[in-house]
């Protein structure tokens, strides 16, 4: 088992909104849970966009999940990762 590296980034989306993206890479096996949580509760599926789980060329895998949030509310959102029985949460950088 190889645990993922998780990286959270933000980018301007539109006035007052930002897109936050959580990327997991370098993990094996490919089964992973990656999702955004608002106030600790998973966001509805229809408010998140997921990338496919793809091989990254090193025998490991990568994927991502993104959502759009209001600027100034970043502290309420965390990216939750679960892989091979291990889990972690990752905040949005300020």
């Amino acid at each position: 088992t190889v645990p993922p590296m998780v990286n959270v980034t933000r980018s301007e989306a539109s006035e007052g909104n930002i897109t936050v993206t959580c990327r997991a890479s370098g993990f094996y096996p490919w089964n992973i849970t990656l999702s955004w949580r608002q106030d600790g509760v998973s966001l509805s599926h229809d408010t998140q966009q997921w990338g496919d789980v793809l091989p990254d060329g090193n025998g490991t895998y990568q994927t991502w999940v993104a959502t759009r949030i209001c600027q100034g509310e970043e502290q309420r959102f965390t990216c939750y990762m679960e892989h091979s029985g291990n889990h972690s949460t990752h905040p949005v950088p300020s």
Epitope: Q38, D39, G40, V41, S42, L43, S44, T47, C70, R76, T78, Y80, E82, G85, H87, T89
Partner: antibody, heavy 121, light 108 residues
Framework: DVQLVESGGGLVQPGGSRKLSCAAS????????IHWVRQAPEKGLEWVAY????????YYADTVKGRFTISRDNPKNTLFLQMTSLRSEDTAMYYC??????????????WGQGTTLTVSS | QIVLTQSPAIMSASLGERVTMTCTAT???????LHWYQQKPGSSPKLWIY???NLASGVPARFSGSGSGTSYSLTIGSMEAEDAATYYC?????????FGTGTKVEIK
């Protein structure tokens, strides 16, 4: 002081409908997620539904999905629970509860006094 | 959905006795998303232990919580009269959120 006051309970016939309300005061309602939790007589707590502060995320317990609808009116500081196709097993005290966020921890920090719904013919 | 089963359902303890109750989940729950609430008759529940092992504000140090995965426990190191209540575990790891079946602690 934070206050949550439920209303709308009463006696309803099986198959009937009812709308519960939860009036909030003493805090900025529009910045908190709120849940409905119920407790049947002499039974345990049962989570019913959740609505995030911006209504973006809504979840229901399997037992009420398709029958109950949670909503909120932020300008009026009010939470609602529209209940349809009511069954005897929906008889319970219904509480609204605030979902706090503090230091990265989320939990129920304030509860209303509850409103009693009885479903019976 | 994740079902939380608490055991025992009811227990009697003497003052000064050590009390342990368990909360078993049908699938794994992150310790961050597992809380315990205390409820006394006629009152609303109160947060008692959060994130599996952290005592909420005002909770006596005789209480402790532990566990991971599918098995969690709450322990009262030395039972006192004011501890008589029903304790519920609660998870929000996955939706729908769920409460445990509850453990009622009585004074023997």
């Amino acid at each position: 002081d934070v206050q949550l006051v439920e209303s709308g309970g009463g006696l309803v016939q099986p198959g009937g409908s009812r709308k519960l309300s939860c009036a909030a005061s003493g805090f900025t309602f529009s910045t908190f997620g709120i849940h409905w939790v119920r407790q049947a007589p002499e039974k345990g707590l049962e989570w019913v539904a959740y609505i995030s502060y911006d209504s973006r995320t809504i979840y229901y317990a399997d037992t009420v999905k398709g029958r109950f609808t949670i909503s909120r009116d932020n300008p009026k500081n009010t939470l609602f629970l529209q209940m349809t196709s009511l069954r005897s097993e929906d008889t319970a005290m219904y509480y609204c509860a605030r979902w706090a966020y503090e230091g990265g921890v989320n939990y129920f920090d304030n509860w209303g006094q509850g409103t009693t719904l009885t479903v019976s013919s | 959905q994740i079902v939380l089963t608490q055991s025992p359902a009811i227990m009697s303890a003497s003052l000064g006795e050590r009390v342990t109750m368990t909360c078993t989940a049908t699938s794994g729950v992150s310790s961050s998303y597992l809380h315990w609430y205390q409820q006394k008759p006629g009152s609303s529940p109160k947060l008692w232990i959060y994130s599996s092992s952290n005592l909420a504000s005002g909770v006596p140090a005789r209480f402790s919580g532990s566990g991971s995965g599918t098995s969690y426990s709450l322990t009262i190191g030395s039972m006192e009269a004011e501890d008589a209540a029903t304790y519920y575990c609660h998870q929000f790891h996955r939706s729908p959120l769920t409460f445990g079946t509850g453990t009622k602690v009585e004074i023997k």
